[in-house]
């Protein structure tokens, strides 16, 4: 059965300066390959977080993604600014050179409210 990427919230609202959690769970870790978060779609989409590296200053993983059975790939964005508004997608890749996108969540739209 093919892996499914579940983003339960269609949208979240957050006040500027606060933090928000974007939820994402997978139904399987197979086939092996990375999980990444993007804002937007298509060629211009922006990488927000990758579970393969740890250099994303305002974004952290919520659960311990180093657990070998971990299926929770939710992220927390801190100190949200108006520029963070947009639709965020949790995306599962299959390993390769380059990695191949095989499944995306339905997206979670982030609305940023004035403080």
């Amino acid at each position: 059965t093919e892996v499914k990427v579940i983003q339960p919230e269609k949208s979240v609202s957050v006040a500027a300066g606060d933090s928000t959690v974007l939820n994402c769970t997978l139904t399987s870790l197979l086939p092996v390959g990375p999980i990444r978060w993007y804002r937007g779609v298509g060629q211009s989409r922006q990488l927000i977080y990758s579970f393969t590296t740890e250099h994303f200053p305002r974004v952290t993983n919520v659960s311990d993604a180093t657990k070998r059975s971990n299926l929770d790939f939710s992220i927390r964005i801190s100190n949200v600014t108006p520029e963070d508004a947009g639709t965020y997608y949790c995306v599962k890749f299959q390993r390769g050179s380059p990695d191949t996108e095989i499944q995306s969540g339905g997206g979670t739209e982030v609305y940023v409210l004035a403080k």
Epitope: V32, D64, T66, K67
Partner: antibody, heavy 118, light 107 residues
Framework: DVQLVESGGAVVRPGESLRLSCAAS????????MSWVRQAPGKGLEWLAG????????YYIDSVKGRFTISRDNSENSLYLQMNSLTAEDTAVYYC???????????WGLGTLVTVSS | ALTQPASVSANPGETVKITCSGG??????YGWYQQKSPGSAPVTVI????KRPSDIPSRFSGSASGSAATLTITGVRVEDEAVYYC???????????FGAGTTLTVL
């Protein structure tokens, strides 16, 4: 610079216990899963056990399950391997290794020698 | 179990390929580790199939397809003489496995 330094290796008798330590520095220890790997004299590398970054999940090869326990203290940047009921087959150099995101290894310690002999 | 040749040899400047078979493309990631003498610390030359650590020379490369992984050393040098171990992480079983090691001799 990432540094992993093992200690605690010794000569022990069959049936005895030993606790190995691995002191980590140069990276955010609490963000990484860790593993223990050993090499018996004249043999190849053998993975023994792994532990998640938070320490809640542990994994073992069948041959050491129930005898060896991997643990960590993130406040001390330390990894441990408690070894019980040791036999001559456990004689080896024991290495700690930092795991990559997909549970392979990127950095290794220099190793500590455990000799089990009567 | 992961299978790799017991030994390979090459002249300086030649290209060496060491294969590692027995994994499953669907569930196994591969890495390669260099050990220059028994009991000395292994050095990671490739992880995640094809990722080379920043301090490893570019003559080392890795690839994976089907049920096998390959370590390629392009323009081998005398200092590359070592035992090379492949390792796999299996996402089904959560277990790591090493091959028996390949002794590279540079003639």
């Amino acid at each position: 610079d990432v540094q992993l330094v093992e200690s605690g290796g010794a000569v022990v008798r069959p049936g005895e216990s030993l606790r190995l330590s691995c002191a980590a520095s140069g990276f955010t220890f609490s963000s990484y899963a860790m593993s223990w790997v050993r090499q018996a004299p004249g043999k190849g590398l053998e993975w023994l056990a792994g532990i998640s970054a938070g320490g809640s999940d542990t994994y073992y090869i069948d041959s050491v399950k129930g005898r060896f326990t991997i643990s960590r203290d993130n406040s001390e940047n330390s990894l441990y391997l408690q070894m019980n009921s040791l036999t001559a087959e456990d004689t080896a150099v024991y290495y700690c290794a930092r795991e990559t995101w997909n549970h392979l290894f990127d950095y290794w310690g220099l190793g500590t020698l455990v000799t089990v002999s009567s | 179990a992961l299978t790799q040749p017991a030994s390979v040899s090459a002249n300086p400047g030649e290209t060496v390929k060491i294969t590692c078979s027995g994994g499953d493309w669907y569930s196994t990631y591969y890495g390669w580790y260099q050990q220059k003498s028994p009991g000395s610390a292994p050095v990671t030359v490739i992880h995640s199939d094809d990722k080379r650590p920043s301090d490893i020379p570019s003559r080392f490369s890795g690839s994976a397809s089907g049920s096998a992984a390959t370590l390629t050393i392009t323009g081998v040098r005398v200092e590359d003489e070592a035992v090379y171990y492949c390792a796999g992480y299996d996402g089904r079983t959560y277990i790591n496995t090493f091959g028996a090691g390949t002794t590279l001799t540079v003639l």
